[in-house]
Amino acid sequence: IPVIEPSVPELVVKPGATVTLRCVGNGSVEWDGPPSPHWTLYSDGSSSILSTNNATFQNTGTYRCTEPGDPLGGSAAIHLYVKDPARPWNVLAQEVVVFEDQDALLPCLLTDPVLEAGVSLVRVRGRPLMRHTNYSFSPWHGFTIHRAKFIQSQDYQCSALMGGRKVMSISIRLKVQKVIPGPPALTLVPAELVRIRGEAAQIVCSASSVDVNFDVFLQHNNTKLAIPQQSDFHNNRYQKVLTLNLDQVDFQHAGNYSCVASNVQGKHSTSMFFRVVESAYLNLSSEQNLIQEVTVGEGLNLKVMVEAYPGLQGFNWTYLGPFSDHQPEPKLANATTKDTYRHTFTLSLPRLKPSEAGRYSFLARNPGGWRALTFELTLRYPPEVSVIWTFINGSGTLLCAASGYPQPNVTWLQCSGHTDRCDEAQVLQVWDDPYPEVLSQEPFHKVTVQSLLTVETLEHNQTYECRAHNSVGSGSWAFIPISAGAHTHPPDEFLFTP
């Protein structure tokens, strides 16, 4: 660490006095102090001498000696007072600029430490400080206004009591600037734009900030547009708005538009795309398969995506049959807008009934015409089974009819004893019928199949069961021969609650 001679923290001299400050270090040393006249500097290796033979009040200040080569960056300081009875203040700067909530140092240095008890800070013309001004004083540095506010941007004077009268410093202008948290906030409206060639369009780029010093511009495909700017102040924010009005758009107006705003903190930008089309358009699509299969009693949502410009003039869901002339309830139709030109329309079909299978069509209209998208809804049913005993071509035959959707598979079981349903332990014989006869198979209806089991002799202490199954479920019917003929046992009634 360098050493200063004289080795005192403060030195008080009179105007016109000779002052010599010597600094000695291990290596080369440098002096730093207030800019003032009459000093001469003499350096000799590891020592440096600062001297004046005519000290003035302007030499008042703190002189610091540093050793540039010292890795620890040590320094020594001495404060010089040049006590001029006519000049109690040495003002180092007449303008101080800080941001709000920073401490503002007004650098009026007292030239005589004895005067410290009678100092005060005032505004020019002897006016008191504004209410709630919190400040402190250091004879070495001056007055500090703590956590300065914008409204404290005033002209100040330092006052000292000398011989019963107040002596003022020259004025110091404090400029307190509002803190800018970051680049301006931006909005670009609309987020997307479509127009038919020849129509009018408007794109609005606006930026806002707590400080008025920021720039905003709108560019089209990297070309900056010359647009008059509107300025405003609202909710304690400055706003600058650029409005691009196009009376008749053409294809060259299409493309990417960027709104860019910048200030000392940086830059923000946001973009949108403008599409110019030859004529109106209306496109319908669905992420779902247009052929839907749903189990009876369950629900289904049919969704259609619409891309259109201009906007829709009408839309509706229609049931095209074949079962009834009922139409979807409007309350089950729902529309959501994804953005300006894309919409999703949903038809909710809860707890589907048999009569609700069929074709559902979504129709939409805009100036580009009508478009439709049709869904085909088939209901799935678990099989329903019935068995009868009959003679075909003179042979005794068990006839099993099963209906459901998808088409049921049929299996015959013969088991010992009389039972409503054969279990594994009782089964004597199993026949699969891979190709039952299809009796009816119409769109949106159940498929009815028939399977024949020719039985030469009915064993009376046995049960014959027809089982049918599909992807939804299974059904069965047990046939029990008795001496007086035959007795059939359907399973528990198939319960259906739509």
Partner: antibody
Framework: QVQLQESGPGLVKPSQTLSLTCTVS??????????WSWIRQHPGKGLEWIGY???????YYNPSLKSRLTISVDTSKHQFSLRLSSVTSADTAVYYC????????????WGQGTLVTVSS | EIVLTQSPDFQSVTPKEKVTITCRAS??????LHWYQQTPDQSPKLLIN???QSFSGVPSRFSGSGSGTDFTLTINSLEAEDAATYYC?????????FGPGTKVDIK
């Protein structure tokens, strides 16, 4: 809340002295928080600051009127006064007294104003 | 002396509309700018002090902004009672000066 009331003649002859008094109520004229001010408004025109005085008698005058202007204060009567000498028709105006917040530098309370016409 | 200029001189506005009045100082005045409202045959009333501080009892539709030399008074959603002349005033240096005023009337 401070209230101010101007009083004085509404008609003054050219070359004479215009004298107005402002009476302060609802607050002390001796409180250090205010400078007591005079402002005038020529007919159909804007506002012109004339000058102000502190309760202790320190004055600040508009340089354009300084040579003809005297503002004084009488704390015992809660009044301050304006004297403008050698008036001409250009001094015809509505004269307002107002309180200047010393900490804030703005005119927060105003009298209702009195029209003074300079005419022979 | 510091000269204050105001624009516009006159503005005719429909109720609920926004009004913006600007005041420019011939030199730096920091935050020492105040706004007054004077309705016909009345004395001026303080609206805003130190650029943006609302004086007590002033409706929130009045707001101020600016710094240095350029300042703005904004009346959001004008009401019939706001028909008046608006003056800016600087207290940065003597002599105190006022702007020439902006007259706002209702269409």
């Amino acid at each position: 809340q401070v209230q101010l009331q101007e009083s004085g003649p509404g008609l003054v002859k050219p070359s004479q002295t215009l004298s107005l008094t402002c009476t302060v109520s609802g607050g002390s004229i001796s409180s250090g928080g205010y400078y007591w001010s005079w402002i005038r408004q020529h007919p159909g025109k804007g506002l012109e600051w004339i000058g102000y005085i502190s309760y202790s008698g320190d004055t600040y005058y508009n340089p354009s009127l300084k040579s003809r202007l005297t503002i004084s204060v009488d704390t015992s009567k809660h009044q301050f006064s304006l004297r403008l000498s050698s008036v001409t028709s250009a001094d015809t105006a509505v004269y307002y007294c107002a309180s200047l917040d010393l900490y804030g530098d703005y005119f927060d309370y105003w009298g209702q104003g009195t029209l003074v016409t300079v005419s022979s | 002396e510091i000269v204050l200029t105001q624009s516009p001189d006159f503005q005719s506005v429909t109720p609920k509309e926004k009004v913006t009045i600007t005041c420019r100082a011939s030199q730096y005045i920091g935050s020492s700018l105040h706004w007054y409202q004077q309705t016909p045959d009345q004395s001026p009333k303080l609206l805003i002090n130190y650029v943006s501080q609302s004086f007590s009892g002033v409706p929130s539709r009045f707001s101020g902004s600016g710094s240095g030399t350029d300042f703005t008074l904004t009346i959001n959603s004008l009401e019939a009672e706001d028909a008046a002349t608006y003056y800016c005033h600087q207290s940065s240096s003597l002599p105190f000066t006022f702007g020439p005023g902006t007259k706002v009337d209702i269409k």
